[in-house]
């Protein structure tokens, strides 16, 4: 019997300082470019080696970005989201959602990483 895959969703505020070559990550998503089924949110698709985000270390590929400097990213066209990041200034505050995959064992058994016991 196979284990069930669950997800642990957490949110975090990440403050980045724009580096010499910018923030150092790519995004996908938007109302006109849904990358995740039934979700027009903005997701991190790539983190540039040695860029500002990589050096900070907290932002991960696959993270959903909920807001930039307090501005909600819901229902934005992809290019509008890109422009928002490019014009966000030197100090950029990101509200992000991390989605961590958790593998549970078969029913009636404890999976690896089960905090109980």
């Amino acid at each position: 019997m196979n284990g069930r895959v669950d997800y642990l969703v957490t949110e975090e505020e990440i403050n980045l300082t724009r580096g010499p070559s910018g923030l150092g990550f790519n995004i996908v998503g938007g109302t006109d470019q849904q990358y995740v089924s039934n979700d027009s949110g903005i997701y991190v698709s790539r983190i540039k080696e040695n860029g500002a985000a990589a050096l900070d270390g907290r932002l991960q590929e696959g993270d959903k970005i909920l807001s930039v400097n307090g501005q909600d990213l819901k229902n934005l066209l992809h290019q509008d989201a890109v422009d928002l990041f490019r014009n966000a200034g030197y100090a950029v505050s990101l509200r992000v959602q991390h989605r961590l995959q958790v593998q549970n064992g078969p029913i009636g058994h404890r999976g690896e990483g089960d905090p109980s016991g």
């Epitope: 150092g24 006109d32 992809h78 290019q79």
Partner: nanobody, 127 residues
Framework: EVQLVESGGGLVQAGGSLRLSCAAS????????MGWFHQAPGKEREFVAE????????GYSDSVKGRFTISRDNAKNTVYLQMNSLKLEDTAVYYC?????????????????????WGQGTQVTVS
């Protein structure tokens, strides 16, 4: 994973034109930023132009602005580089490149580190 195949290179006289094409595999082509780089003999690979997934945003190196035009046809999974007013110094191998998503940084700083997938290149010689 994306495979890229360039075509359209060749020998052309100074002042002439060429159009390079880059055919890409993959189902989500419109989610990829596409770029062109060139590499002259004995030199590093340098950014030429890039285009966003929807085609609405483009960027060019100063050396080709006003002469080269990048475009894409997402229905055909193809990106193009129209090269006009070619100069001797445009002689190089031209590489197509792709990266998932749109960079949140302007195209002023593009380097090979900004792209993950590369074609084999096509030779352009201006005489």
């Amino acid at each position: 994973e994306v495979q890229l195949v360039e075509s359209g290179g060749g020998l052309v006289q100074a002042g002439g034109s060429l159009r390079l094409s880059c055919a890409a595999s993959g189902r989500t082509f419109s989610s990829y930023t596409m770029g062109w780089f060139h590499q002259a003999p004995g030199k590093e690979r340098e950014f030429v132009a890039e285009i966003s997934g929807t085609g609405g945003n483009t960027g060019y190196s100063d050396s080709v602005k006003g002469r080269f035009t990048i475009s894409r046809d997402n229905a055909k999974n193809t990106v193009y580089l129209q090269m006009n007013s070619l100069k001797l110094e445009d002689t190089a191998v031209y590489y197509c490149a792709a990266v998932l998503g749109s960079p949140t940084d302007s195209s002023d700083y593009r380097s090979t580190l900004d792209y993950d997938y590369w074609g084999q290149g096509t030779q352009v010689t201006v005489s």
